[in-house]
Interface confidence: low
């Protein structure tokens, strides 16, 4: 029996719905009193939902999935996933029996946008060119890992002396802050990029400094 | 400038394990904005990528290799590695470490590349 | 995944002559954020790859001038202004927007 989901993961907001498609095909005659479907989480095995004896056996996993039942019988065993947390990520199994066996697995990848970032400046006044400055881009409640990338006025990588560090709140999400030591000259734009790369969002922060005051667009 | 060197075994024997260690030096894992990643090359052909760390532990794979392929990093020993499984023939290939910078997507460093061969 | 597609495959050149490579991308790379993500980089013979152009245009550090980038959304050129000996090899594109990265196939640079 063959049983297809698709290829590429499903991508899903936090907090929103997903669906996790499988479909299978349905010889002629086919009833649902033949059909055997479970999904479970690929690694551990856990049963997440399913349907035996005609009957949809319900949600294991947390109440919160859902079959199709009005498109069962033309193969579509599709897995409906509400509020999509973090810790939902990863591979789900359909497995799907009639006379024949079949299985597919299916990815679902977590994401959530990033705050537009925040900038602070330290010192933050009396500042002259040569002084160094530390300035820190700080960006929340995203998923995945962010990518940070700091960059001066004139659109040129600014590299050398850049800490990051992402730490992950009890919903998994992460909040970012990216801290740039630069030593000022005569005026100047730095901007901050916050970049969730599977959403292939950026988010966007920048501090000019020019004598005084400083600007925080 | 940053130096990136590849050590590990040239000969693999297929379905075993590609073990892979990258190195770097005059330049510090843990600085943000750098994504530590393994390319590889195969015998008279282009580059192919394979995935890339951040220093906190963050990674991403190539969906063609993802179900073989580990990375990880050791920000003590200034060191990222690479795991490969279940290797063939197909996996012989040179196998470099690079730095990609976060701004441009660009790999602006590379290791010298290992050439791996699996054979039995 | 987006597929580069270079020509030409071979490009014998006389020094001192210019030369030119194409690089076609299935999608644009062009970003909401304004940036092109296509980079070029150069492979001598027996050596690892160098870094030559980022973002489209932007020459890496230590670049001679006689390299340059050019294009945009789905359509990019390398150009040498004048071939020199040291410039052979296989001269990759790349695209940076997103995973997978991927590569053209190459274009083998040879002096006539």
């Known amino acids: 029996l063959e049983v297809q989901v698709p290829e590429d993961p499903v991508v899903a907001l936090v907090g929103t719905d997903a669906t996790l498609c499988c479909s299978f095909s349905p010889e002629p005659g086919f009833s649902l009193a033949q059909l055997n479907l479970i999904w479970q989480l690929t690694d551990t095995k856990q049963l997440v939902h399913s349907f035996a004896e005609g009957q949809d056996q319900g949600s294991a996993y947390a109440n919160r999935t859902a079959l199709f039942p009005d498109l069962l019988a033309q193969g579509n065993a599709s897995l409906r996933l509400q509020r999509v947390r973090v810790a939902d990520e990863g591979s789900f199994t359909c497995f799907v029996s009639i006379r024949d066996f079949g299985s597919a697995a299916v990815s679902l990848q977590v994401a959530a946008p990033y705050s537009k970032p925040s900038m602070t400046l330290e010192p933050n006044k009396d500042l002259r060119p040569g002084d160094t400055v530390t300035i820190t881009c700080s960006s929340y409640r995203g998923y995945p890992e962010a990518e940070v990338f700091w960059q001066d006025g004139q659109g040129v990588p600014l590299t050398g002396n850049v800490t990051t560090s992402q730490m992950a709140n009890e919903q998994g999400l992460f909040d970012v802050h990216s801290v740039l030591r630069v030593v000022l000259g005569a005026n100047g734009t730095y901007s901050c990029l916050v970049r969730n790369p599977v959403l292939q969002q950026d988010a966007h922060g920048s501090v000019t400094i020019t004598g005084q005051p400083m600007t925080f667009p | 400038q940053v130096q990136l060197v590849e050590s590990g075994p040239g000969l693999v024997k297929p379905s075993q394990t590609l073990s892979l260690t990258c190195t770097v030096s005059d330049g510090s894992i843990s600085s943000g904005g750098y994504y530590w990643s393994w390319i590889r090359q195969h015998p008279g052909k282009g580059l192919e990528w394979i995935g890339y760390?951040?220093?906190?532990?963050?990674?991403y794979y190539s969906p063609s290799l993802k179900s073989r392929v580990t990375i990880s990093v050791d920000t003590s020993k200034n060191q990222f590695s690479l795991k490969l499984t279940s290797v063939t023939a197909a996996d012989t290939a040179v196998y470099y470490c690079?730095?990609?910078?976060?701004?441009?997507?660009?790999?602006?460093?590379w290791g010298q590349g290992i050439l791996v061969t699996v054979s039995s | 995944e987006i597929v580069l597609t270079q020509s030409p495959l071979s490009l014998p050149v006389t020094p001192g002559e210019p030369a030119s490579i194409s690089c076609r991308s299935s999608q644009s790379l062009l970003y909401s954020n304004g940036y092109t993500y296509l980079d070029w980089y150069l492979q001598k013979p027996g050596q690892s790859p160098q870094f030559l152009i980022y973002?489209?245009?932007n020459r890496a550090s230590g670049v001679p001038d006689r390299f340059s980038g050019s294009g945009s959304g789905t359509d990019f050129t390398l150009k040498i202004s004048r071939v020199e000996a040291e410039d052979v090899g296989v001269y990759y594109c790349m695209q940076g927007l997103q995973t997978p990265y991927t590569f053209g196939q190459g274009t083998k640079l040879e002096i006539k």
């Open positions: 690079a730095r990609r910078a976060g701004y441009s997507s660009s790999f602006d460093s």
């Open positions: 760390i951040y220093y906190s532990g963050g990674t």
């Open positions: 973002l489209g245009f």
